[in-house]
Amino acid sequence: SEVEYRAEVGQNAYLPCFYTPAAPGNLVPVCWGKGACPVFECGNVVLRTDERDVNYWTSRYWLNGDFRKGDVSLTIENVTLADSGIYCCRIQIPGIMNDEKFNLKLVIKPAKVTPAPTRQRDFTAAFPRMLTTRGHGPAETQTLGSLPDINLTQISTLANELRDSRLANDLRDSGATIRIG
């Protein structure tokens, strides 16, 4: 079961994916593809980075975060219903059977049609917090809460740091489909 992310038609969608570089600027190739992660590489590649830079991208797909620090979260601009589906973020760690694979499910909802407001509305009601904004980042990872509630952003941020700990094993088994490849 893939972790699910939602956005509305016309919005930008945000799909989180992180890794920890061995050292600043010591990057690992990453690919993003439409469809579940296959055995190797990514299918239907929409964006790819190498050891230095983003070396392939298609229109509307970009990295908004600092990929040089391991934030390879994908932003999809101005989404349509056709953007719904599973996306694969693959951290291509050198050597065989090392890749970290994350399958993320994007659900696009039709845009809400609302009548023109007759009075000032509450800001948070007019602009509900969407998953297209940044989720929990590394600074918040100490407040884990109960395991089933941890989102993929937290898990993927923590995956390497907690590699050998019992908590990491619990995280991997928590149903968030983290996959060591």
Epitope: T20, A22, G70, I91, P94, I96, N160, R172, I180
Partner: antibody
Amino acid sequence: EVQLVQSGAEVKKPGESLKISCKGSGYSFTSYWMQWVRQMPGKGLEWMGAIYPGDGDIRYTQNFKGQVTISADKSISTAYLQWSSLKASDTAMYYCARWEKSTTVVQRNYFDYWGQGTTVTVSS
Amino acid sequence: DIQMTQSPSSLSASVGDRVTITCKASENVGTFVSWYQQKPGKAPKLLIYGASNRYTGVPSRFSGSGSGTDFTLTISSLQPEDFATYYCGQSYSYPTFGQGTKLEIK
């Protein structure tokens, strides 16, 4: 304590089927690749293939593709190696071994824990 | 497949000797090389990984070196329990092993 316990020795006739097992304990079974390695009598080690029980990803080396089937049952933390039709040349010791993968920070990629081995003898 | 060629295939030595076993990869494998020790009737045991890192609990007399295609395992002072067969293995691509070096008592 990490342990891999394999099923007992088997004596079979050519053409028979066989399924041997490897039960992992003391670690998160779904978070590590489980590998199978063959050692024919008096010979060296040959990697056969592997399974990642977390999502069922399976890899085979070319020599063993179509010859054996690797599977796993997450619910009982057990990996399997099976043959549908054994040959005399399948006579060997078969080991399961846990694979420690690399991360972006640490290079690993090694077999860190091994089962005790299952001897398979195929003879008419 | 990447071939790993180990030499010598057998070696006689005495307790206290310094012993070196070499392994050559058919193509560049970086430092994705491990060394294993196997005693008769037993499963292999990991000694060295990443070409030069000693695995937990392995005595300091065991050391590994090399990168690219040429690798060595050195036992600085042989102990009685070190007489066994040693295998190198690469894990840059699907794992392959050398044919083994049998270390015997002289």
